[in-house]
């Protein structure tokens, strides 16, 4: 796993644990609250986050409408259970053993059951709507410049293949960010939309997971995007199952 | 070279607590993960947790939460674990051992910890 | 947790004969498993890491192979002084956990 050699770090996760203790001598880092050996040259997947983080001392119509199976993640954080490669398990339980169904960015697409309620796949989550209120400014963004300043964003701070980056939308002070992936687009070492979300998300709420770096910085032609407010919609492959209108 | 030193037995009162210590010499005390293995007589290895002495991040089998802790003194380059209210099943050995690469390739000796009034 | 199983739980073998341990990990964990001797009444020795890597000082006879879910440690050729407590232990994540151990005598 590669990790910064000179100090020991994990550059793309400060939630880790490192020690030159890996295969070789090399450096090791292992995520906080599951000790998954986690490869520091990339994002590591929202789940072990996650995990991490509950173990840490705890309109006009130029904007897209959501999707009626558009989901939302209401449920707030919980202990997530991942499987070997970090991914999030399709069925979660809490400690009263009420479980439910979830994504591939383990926000909940099914109504809470028992220990009963089985889980058949885990659901992709191919489309991602990242909705961005800003700070009022002066005048309105160049809308180009914005959307090149996002993209740049995407590719650069979190390896994102530029062409999960679908659209840009831009209404003043409304940003709209659309990834997509489906499963058959994301090669071996592609970063996973829903980690490059996660990522961001955490980063615009002045919680960035990088180690060392400075918190987010946007600019566009030198003028500071500060943004307000965060909403995310998540679309499944597969439309959620829960028994009502929510 | 690299060696952990253990003392070879504890006798404790069930419910007085104990802390067993295990210090490190020959290597870098504070580059390696600590870790403690408990072997009941005639059974198996049990992990019971381990510490990280550069920040004393640790980890505990879920297990051993509430009657293991485990601290480091960086100054000595010791490992201690205390064990609180202890009962006759924690009569065991207890093996410190700290790993190059993941394998635990350093053990000490082990400390015989007998509860008994 | 990852759940180590170790089977038999009694090996007894002849010397010079080869002879193989099997250690089955619940779920995928890549090559984290390392190999433990532990002779009577001494600490375990860590024979193989990372499945299949040798540790300098152990014997040649010894080797490990697998990765997955399915392990296995061979001694090529058992000797007398291979007589001992054989444990398999993951390293892939918290809490690691140790299989329950097999024992070799020789017949």
């Known amino acids: 796993h590669t990790a910064a050699q000179d100090n020991c770090t994990c550059p793309t996760n400060k939630m880790t644990v490192c020690s030159p203790d890996g295969p070789g001598g090399r450096c090791q880092c292992r995520a906080l609250g599951s000790g998954v050996a986690v490869d520091c040259s990339t994002l590591t997947s929202e789940c072990l986050l996650l995990k991490a983080r509950m173990s840490a001392p705890k309109n006009a119509r130029t904007l897209v409408r959501p999707n009626e199976h558009a989901l939302v993640d209401n449920d707030g954080l919980y202990d997530p259970d991942c499987d070997p490669e970090g991914r999030f398990k399709a069925r979660q339980c809490n400690q009263t053993s009420v479980c439910w169904c979830v994504n591939s960015v383990g926000v909940r697409r099914t109504d809470k059951g028992d220990l009963s309620l089985r889980c058949d796949e885990l659901v992709r989550t191919h489309h991602i709507l990242i909705d961005l209120r800003h700070r009022p400014t002066a005048g309105a963004f160049n809308h180009s410049d914005l959307d090149a300043e996002l993209r740049r964003l995407f590719r650069e701070r979190y390896r994102l293949h530029p062409k999960f980056v679908a659209a840009v939308h831009y209404e003043q002070p409304t940003i709209q960010i659309e990834l997509r992936q489906n499963t058959s687009q994301k090669a071996a070492g592609d970063v996973d939309i829903g980690d490059a979300a996660y990522y961001f998300e955490r980063d615009v709420k002045g919680e960035s997971l990088f180690q060392g770096r400075g918190g987010l910085d946007l600019r566009v032609r030198g003028e500071p995007l500060q943004v307000e407010r965060t909403l995310i919609y998540y679309l499944d492959e597969i439309p959620p199952k829960f028994s009502m209108k929510r | 070279q690299v060696q952990l030193q253990q003392p070879g037995a504890e006798l404790v009162r069930p419910g007085a607590s104990v802390n067993l210590s295990c210090k490190a010499s020959?290597?870098?005390?504070?580059?390696?993960?600590i870790n403690w293995v408990k072997q009941r007589p005639g059974q198996g290895l049990e992990w019971i947790g381990n510490?990280?002495?550069?920040?004393?991040?640790?980890n505990y089998n879920q297990k051993f939460k509430d009657t293991a802790t485990l601290t480091v003194d960086k100054s000595s380059s010791t490992a201690y674990m205390q064990l609180s209210s202890p009962t006759s099943e924690d009569s065991a050995v207890y093996f410190c051992?700290?790993?190059?690469?993941?394998?635990?390739?350093?053990w000490g000796q082990g400390t015989l910890v007998t509860v008994s009034a | 947790d990852i759940l180590l199983t170790q089977s038999p739980a009694i090996l007894s073998v002849s010397p010079g004969e080869k002879v193989s341990f099997s250690c089955r990990a619940s779920?995928?964990?890549?090559?984290?498993i390392h190999w433990y001797q532990q002779r009577t009444n001494g600490s375990p020795r860590l024979l193989i890491e990372?499945?299949?890597e040798s540790i300098s000082g152990i014997p040649s006879r010894f080797s490990g192979s697998g990765s997955g879910t399915d392990f296995t440690l061979t001694i090529n050729s058992v000797e007398s002084e291979d007589i001992a407590d054989y444990y398999c232990?993951?390293?892939?994540?918290?809490?690691?956990?140790f299989g329950g151990g097999t024992k070799l005598e020789i017949k």
């Open positions: 051992s700290s790993y190059r690469s993941d394998g635990f390739a350093y």
């Open positions: 020959g290597y870098t005390f504070t580059s390696y993960w």
């Open positions: 510490i990280y002495p550069s920040n004393s991040y640790t």
């Open positions: 779920q995928n964990i890549g090559t984290s």
């Open positions: 990372f499945a299949s």
């Open positions: 232990q993951q390293s892939n994540s918290w809490p690691f956990t």
